[in-house]
C-alpha cells in the first residue's frame, strides 16, 4: 500500500488557447484531470487502474501552482494504491478549460481540452521527487512525482507491513526495509523474548521482562546457578535439585547422622584415642591412669588391687608399691613364706599344701577371694555394665544402674523408641540417642513416612531388553512397552520361549 504523489508546479499557455486552436474567452480557466494506470508500451484507453484525481481550477492561462501540502490542500495530488507497487506506470495529465464552476465532463464545452500529456516508465519507491517538463505546440507543464509507502508499509514496493509495537505481541520499531528492530532488552523473530539478566543460567533461569532472572523449581541464587538441596538436608550439598549428597562424616537421608562423632564432638578426655564405631557411636581408648566411657575418670593404680595375700597398696607418682604382711614377699606379695601349718586362709577358707609343703593355696568360700580368702568379692571389678552403666555392689550380688536410653541386666539393651512401630507405610525405624528416625520407602516422606509423594516407578529401570518404561502416576506403578520379540510384564521373556507356568 502506498501513494503516488504528483506535484504540479507550473503551467504555461501564453496565448490562452484550447487544443483545437480556439482561444478561451476571456482566458483559459484551467483545471487538471490525472489518470494513473499500469505500464502500457503505448498509453491506451481503458481504466485508470492505479486511480484518478481532479483538481479545482488552479489558474488562468499561465500560472505557478502553490504547494498546499502543509495546509491540507491538493498539491501534491495524492493517488493512493493498495497493492504492491509494480515499479512501472503510465501517467496521463489533461489540462481542461472550465468556463463555469461545474467541472463534470458532460458540463464542459465540446472542445474544452487544452492539452494532454501521457508518459510511462519506471519509478522506484523513494522520497526523492522526479522533475519532468512536457511541452506541446502551445503549452508547457512542469511537474514532479514520486511514490512513497503508506504508514506502516515498507520495502522496495511497499509490500511489507510493519507496525511498531511495545506490548505482549512484540517490542520493536520498523527499519526502512520493513524488518523489525527490537527495542533494547528484547530479542527473537518478533522481539517477544526478553533478554534476561546477563549470566542468568540458560536452562535453570528465565525471565518475563528484560534484565530479570527468575529461577525454575529447584534452583536459586541471583543467576539461578545454585541448586536447592532436599528439604531438611543438614550436612549435605547438591549438584542437581533436591539432592542431598552428604559432607564427609555424615550419613542418612538428610545427612544428619553423625558418622564421625570423634571429629565433630571430641568426646574422649585426658588424651584418650577416639575411634568411630558407627552412627553416633565411638570408643575411647584411655591412657594409663584413666577410665570411664570417655576416660574422664582418673584411675588410682591401687584400684585394681594388685597386692596379693593381704598386702596393702600405696600409690606412688610412678606407679604403686605393695606392703606385704608377715610371711609374704614379692612385687605383689605373691610369694609366701607360710605353710598350712600357719593357718593362712581367712574367712573359712581351706588350705591345700603344694610343692611338698613349701607352698600352699587357699580354697575360698563363696563371696571371698584373694590368695588367703582375705577379700570380699567385689562383683564390679570386671566392669560388667555396658554403655556407661554404673556398677553397684549389693551384698552377695551386684546391679547395674543404666544411663538414659539403656536397659537390661548389664545395660546392654537400648530403650527402643522403635518398639511401637512409629514409621508408617513400611518405613524403617532407627533408634537415636535422643529419639528415632524413619527411613521411608520410595513414594513416602515426612518425619513418620506419613506423606505420600509421587515417585518415578521407572527410576529403578525395571524393564528388560531395552523396553520403554512408563510411569502410571495414578498408582505409582510402571508399565513396560516391549520391543519386538519380547513379552512379559518386564519384557523379560523372548517370544517363543514362554515362561513355565505351574498350571
Amino acid at each position: 500500500s502506498g501513494v503516488f504523489q504528483l506535484q504540479l508546479q507550473e503551467f504555461i499557455n501564453e496565448r490562452g488557447v484550447l487544443a483545437s486552436g480556439r482561444p478561451c474567452e476571456p482566458g483559459c480557466r484551467t483545471f487538471f484531470r490525472v489518470c494513473l494506470k499500469h505500464f502500457q508500451a503505448v498509453v491506451s484507453p481503458g481504466p485508470c487502474t492505479f486511480g484518478t484525481v481532479s483538481t479545482p481550477v488552479l489558474g488562468t492561462n499561465s500560472f505557478a501552482v502553490r504547494d498546499d501540502s502543509s495546509g491540507g490542500g491538493r498539491n501534491p495530488l495524492q493517488l493512493p494504491f493498495n497493492f504492491t507497487w509494480p515499479g512501472t506506470f503510465s501517467l496521463i495529465i489533461e489540462a481542461w478549460h472550465a468556463p463555469g464552476d461545474d467541472l463534470r465532463p458532460e458540463a464542459l464545452p465540446p472542445d474544452a481540452l487544452i492539452s494532454k500529456i501521457a508518459i510511462q516508465g519506471s519509478l522506484a519507491v523513494g522520497q526523492n521527487w522526479l522533475l519532468d517538463e512536457q511541452t506541446s505546440t502551445l503549452t508547457r507543464l512542469r511537474y514532479s512525482y514520486r511514490v512513497i509507502c503508506s504508514d506502516n508499509y515498507y520495502g522496495d514496493n511497499c509490500s511489507r507491513l510493519c507496525k511498531k509495537r511495545n506490548d505482549h505481541f512484540g517490542h520493536y520499531v520498523c527499519q526502512p526495509d520493513g524488518n523489525l528492530s527490537c527495542l533494547p532488552g528484547w530479542t527473537g523473530e518478533y522481539c517477544q523474548q526478553p533478554i534476561c539478566l546477563s549470566g542468568c543460567h540458560e536452562q535453570n533461569g528465565y525471565c518475563s521482562k528484560p534484565a530479570e532472572c527468575l529461577c525454575r523449581p529447584g534452583w536459586q541464587g541471583r543467576l539461578c546457578n545454585e541448586c536447592i538441596p532436599h528439604n531438611g538436608c543438614r550436612h549435605g550439598t547438591c549438584s542437581t535439585p533436591w539432592q542431598c549428597t552428604c559432607d564427609e562424616g555424615w550419613g542418612g537421608l538428610f545427612c544428619d547422622q553423625d558418622l564421625n562423632y570423634c571429629t565433630h564432638h571430641s568426646p574422649c578426655k585426658n588424651g584418650a584415642t577416639c575411634s568411630n564405631s558407627g552412627q553416633r557411636s565411638y570408643t575411647c581408648t584411655c591412657r594409663p591412669g584413666y577410665t570411664g566411657v570417655d576416660c574422664e575418670l582418673e584411675l588410682s593404680e591401687c584400684d585394681s588391687n594388685p597386692c596379693r595375700n593381704g598386702g596393702s597398696c600405696k600409690d606412688q607418682e610412678d606407679g604403686y608399691h605393695c606392703l606385704c604382711p608377715p610371711g609374704y614377699y614379692g612385687l605383689h606379695c605373691e610369694h609366701s613364706t607360710l605353710s598350712c601349718a600357719d593357718s593362712p586362709c581367712f574367712n573359712g577358707g581351706s588350705c591345700r599344701e603344694r610343692n611338698q609343703g613349701a607352698n600352699y593355696a587357699c580354697e575360698c568360700p563363696p563371696n571371698f577371694t584373694g590368695s588367703n580368702c582375705e577379700k570380699k568379692v567385689d562383683r564390679c571389678t570386671s566392669n560388667p555394665c555396658a554403655n556407661g552403666g554404673q556398677c553397684l555392689n549389693r551384698g552377695p550380688s551386684r546391679m547395674c544402674r543404666c544411663r538414659p536410653g539403656f536397659t537390661g541386666t548389664y545395660c546392654e539393651l537400648h530403650v527402643s523408641d522403635c518398639a511401637r512401630n512409629p514409621c508408617a507405610h513400611g518405613g524403617t525405624c532407627h533408634d537415636l540417642e535422643n529419639g528415632l528416625m524413619c527411613t521411608c520407602p520410595a513414594g513416602f516422606s515426612g518425619r513418620r513416612c506419613e506423606v505420600r509423594t509421587s515417585i518415578d516407578a521407572c527410576a529403578s529401570s525395571p524393564c528388560f531388553n531395552r523396553a520403554t518404561c512408563y510411569t502410571d502416576l495414578s498408582t505409582d506403578t510402571f508399565v513396560c512397552n516391549c520391543p519386538y520379540g519380547f513379552v512379559g510384564s518386564r519384557c523379560e521373556f523372548p517370544v517363543g520361549l514362554p515362561p513355565s507356568f505351574p498350571w
Epitope: P45, F50, P110
Partner: antibody
Framework: EVQLQQSGPELVKTGASVKISCKAS????????IHWVKQSHGKSLEWIGY????????NYNQKFKGKATFTVDTSSSTAFMQFNSLTSEDSAVYYC????????????WGQGTSVTVSS | DIVLTQSPASLAVSLGQRATISCRAS??????????MKWFQQKPGQPPKLLIY???NQGSGVPARFSGSGSGTDFSLNIHPMEEDDTAMYFC?????????FGGGTKLEIK
Amino acid sequence: EVQLQQSGPELVKTGASVKISCKASGYSFTAYYIHWVKQSHGKSLEWIGYISCYNGATNYNQKFKGKATFTVDTSSSTAFMQFNSLTSEDSAVYYCARDYDYDVGMDYWGQGTSVTVSS
Amino acid sequence: DIVLTQSPASLAVSLGQRATISCRASESVDNYGISFMKWFQQKPGQPPKLLIYAASNQGSGVPARFSGSGSGTDFSLNIHPMEEDDTAMYFCQQSKEVPWTFGGGTKLEIK
C-alpha cells in the same frame, strides 16, 4: 449531444482502396480515442485498432497491419480509416467508436459504413 | 490472443423471467483488481450499444435490469425482468490485451 457521423456506403472493386470518415461532435474530440470495428454479414465483431485524436498515436490489430491506416483531422474533429488492396473478405460494415482514458469503454458508436467489394 | 467463448449461442426467455448469458475467457482479463470486460447489445441494423463496463458497472442510460458479474475468466450478463425491447444480439468484449476481442455473440429472443 455526442454524435459520431460516418460516411456513406461504398461499392469498390477488388484491389482498390477505400477511405471511410467519422465526424465527431458534442465532445472534446482531442481528449478521446477513435476505435474502428469490423462486422462481417451475420458475424461477430472484430477490433481493427484505435488512434489517439490528441497526438495521432495508433495501435493496430496485427491482423489488419498494412491493410488499415488511421488518421485524424483535429480542425474538423474527423477520424479516417483507409483500407487498401480490398478483397471480398473485406466486405463488411465498419464502425467507429469513441473511447477515453478514464475507462467507460466504447460508449458512443457511429451508425456504420457498409463496404462491398466486387470483382 | 484472448479468446472469448459465449454460451448459449441463442436463448429464448419468457417476458418477466431472467436471462443469463455467460462469457468465458481463455485467460484472466483482470489487472490490478479491475476486470477489463464489457457487454454490448446490438439490434438489427444498429451499431452496438455499451451496457456494462469493468464487468459490473452500468453504462450511461442503461436500465437497472441489466447487470454484470464475474472476475478472472468467468463472466455473466443478467437481464431481469426480460422485456420485449431486450430481443437482440449480445456480445462480451475484453480490453485487457491488444488485440481487443469480442465473443461470438448470443441471440436473445422472447419465448
